[in-house]
């Protein structure tokens, strides 16, 4: 048993150009908070496979105010850190998920409203115990900075938290069967919850419920010494039952090298040698290469035959990061011309073109409406020497008569929140906003000071349109 | 990117009228949500009255009755019909069009309003 600890150090624009606009604004402050997901790093699981070794979410950081015209600098986090406790042995390699939220606090009808900010993934060797390790990871134009470690709760320790310590019951030597704790060699391993009735002097485990004996003991409970040949080569205590020395517990004992590993005595202690794939003290820790399937999504492993060479993961189309683990914004490579809206709908980058283009990515200029009506409150405007339909909002195509969803292109302005309806949509503005679309200031330069509805204003029309 | 050019402005008496214009230099104004707004001395910016791209109107309480807002699609212009006027709607009169192509707000460079007897 044992706890991940995970510390956040900043959260900000990444280098380079293209930075972030700021999460929050004076008109609409908002709050940061973290989530990280943590997942046995061996096991095929998917992204979105439930977070088996566990998950845990920050505390909500200070409200942060944008100042207008400032570059979106790093921005405040929240205290402590974050901590995923794991009850079983901490696997050596693990994938992480970590996700940068938002928390508006505007005046949001139904309380506060939350949204991903940034998800960053990746897949990692981690032995307990250790230092805290370092890492920068990048979604998009954002750069998230932080530090991870895995520390064993005591009475456990070792890189995977599977042996037990206590202190030393006797100052010179630790009990039989028991071997000190490095490097708290002031501490003894403690036994493991053997099987009932295992002998607590002849037999010890390496696994809850089994009972393994020490040489010269046998039977299922290491109650029943063997012959006195096992006297041959002493080393170690008299034994009162068979009145020879029966062999003390040597380092390599039961082999405690796990994983295939093979065990030498050292002049203090012993030395696994592992198989390919391994390492550790005891073989324990599993290092990721391609035969391990590191890359999500489909993605192509490549390289990384042993555990100390890289592997590289080829993504497929949609899909980018170290593993193949995030999604691409494809969207953000603007393949819409024209001025086209680009919609990323997963399995197919589609865009929306203005009226008066056409094509997949809104590459062909139509030459002429003339003679058609433009359906749906549509205009035919002359442009570039060649007539057009200019559409209504929610509708596109050469002629309008495509029907968008109300919602999908974002018709309400200034942060106002979209709402479809069965006739339409509204939009429900952000204080300080007004219009039918929240396209008009109040007080341009103050709309986050007023109200939602600001006194000795009102509307013309209900706020509902097609 | 949207220009906007106001005019119109000028010295009228207590009670007079006058008749603000504005020309916005894009393909398709029915793409613009158009407005007028004023700024008085030593006040903020308030919005004055406002034409969403659908026709829907909107006023400040204090020019209701008073302001008409009307746009000519054909002529790409919005216009802003004042009678009625008082000294306290003295200021400078901006014209703005919120731009629904590149989601991007534009104002004019104003145009000044003196009502004086």
């Known amino acids: 048993a044992g706890v991940f600890e995970l510390q956040i150090h900043s959260f900000g624009p990444g280098p380079g150009p293209g930075a972030p606009r700021s999460p929050c604004s004076a008109r609409l402050p908002c709050r940061l908070f973290f989530r990280v997901c943590l997942k046995p790093g061996l096991s095929e699981e998917a992204a979105e496979s439930p977070c088996a070794l566990g998950a845990a979410l920050s505390a909500r950081g200070p409200v942060y105010t944008e100042q207008p015209g400032a570059p979106a600098p790093d921005l405040p986090l929240p205290d402590g850190l974050l901590q995923v406790p794991f009850r079983d042995a901490w696997p050596g390699t693990f994938s992480f998920i970590i996700e940068t939220w938002r928390e508006e606090l505007g005046d949001q009808i139904g309380g506060p409203a939350w949204s991903l900010l940034a998800r960053v993934a990746g897949r990692r060797r981690l032995a307990a115990g250790g230092p805290w390790a370092r890492d920068i990871q990048r979604a998009g134009a954002w750069e998230l900075r932080f530090s991870y470690r895995a520390r064993c709760e005591p009475p456990a320790v070792g890189t995977a938290c599977t042996r037990l310590c206590r202190p030393r019951s006797a100052p010179s030597r630790c009990g039989p069967g028991l071997r000190p704790c490095a490097p708290l060699e002031d501490e003894c391993e403690a036994p493991l919850v053997c099987r009932a009735g295992c002998s607590p002097e002849h037999g010890f485990c390496e696994q809850p419920g089994e009972c393994r004996c020490l040489e010269g003991w046998t039977g299922p409970l290491c109650t029943v010494p063997v012959s006195t040949s096992s006297c041959l080569s002493p080393r170690g205590p008299s034994s009162a039952t068979t009145g020879c020395l029966v062999p003390g517990p040597g380092p390599c004992d039961g082999n405690p090298c796990a994983n295939g590993g093979s065990c030498s005595e050292t002049p203090r202690s012993f030395e696994c040698t592992c198989p390919r794939g391994f390492y550790g003290l005891r073989c324990e820790v599993s290092g990721v290469t391609c035969a391990d399937g590191p890359c999500f999504n489909g993605g192509l492993c490549v390289g990384g035959a042993d555990p100390d060479s890289a592997y590289i993961c080829h993504c497929p189309p949609g899909f980018q990061g170290s593993n193949c683990e995030k999604r691409v914004d494809r969207c953000s490579l603007q393949p819409c011309r024209n001025g086209g809206l680009c919609l990323d709908l997963g399995h197919a980058l589609r865009c929306r073109c203005r009226a008066g283009f056409a094509g997949p990515r809104c590459e062909h200029d139509l030459d002429d409406c003339a003679g058609r009506a433009c359906a749906n409150g549509g205009t035919c405007v002359e442009g570039g020497g060649a007539h057009r339909c200019s559409c209504a909002l929610g509708f596109g195509g050469r002629d309008c008569r495509e029907r968008a969803d109300p919602c999908a292109a974002r018709p309400c302005a200034h942060g106002g929140r979209c709402y479809a309806h069965f006739s339409g949509l509204v939009c429900a503005c952000a204080p300080g906003y007004m219009g039918a679309r929240c396209e008009f200031p109040v007080h341009p330069d103050g709309a986050s000071a007023l109200p939602a509805a600001p006194p000795g204003l009102r509307p013309g029309d209900p706020q509902r349109y097609l | 990117e949207v220009q906007l050019v106001e005019s119109g402005g000028g010295l009228v008496q207590p009670g007079g009228s006058l008749t603000l214009s504005c020309a916005a230099s894009h393909s398709s104004v029915t793409s613009l949500s158009l407005a007028w707004y004023r700024q008085a001395p030593g006040k903020k910016r308030e919005l004055v009255a406002g034409?969403?791209?659908?026709?829907?109107?909107y006023y400040a309480e204090s020019v209701k009755g008073r302001f008409t807002i009307s746009r000519d699609n054909a002529k790409n212009s919005v216009y802003l019909q004042m009678n009625s006027l008082r000294a306290e709607d003295t200021a400078v009169y901006y014209c703005y069009a919120y731009s629904w192509t590149d989601r991007l707000p534009y104002w004019g460079q104003g145009t000044l309003v003196t009502v004086s007897s």
């Open positions: 034409i969403s791209y659908d026709g829907s109107k």
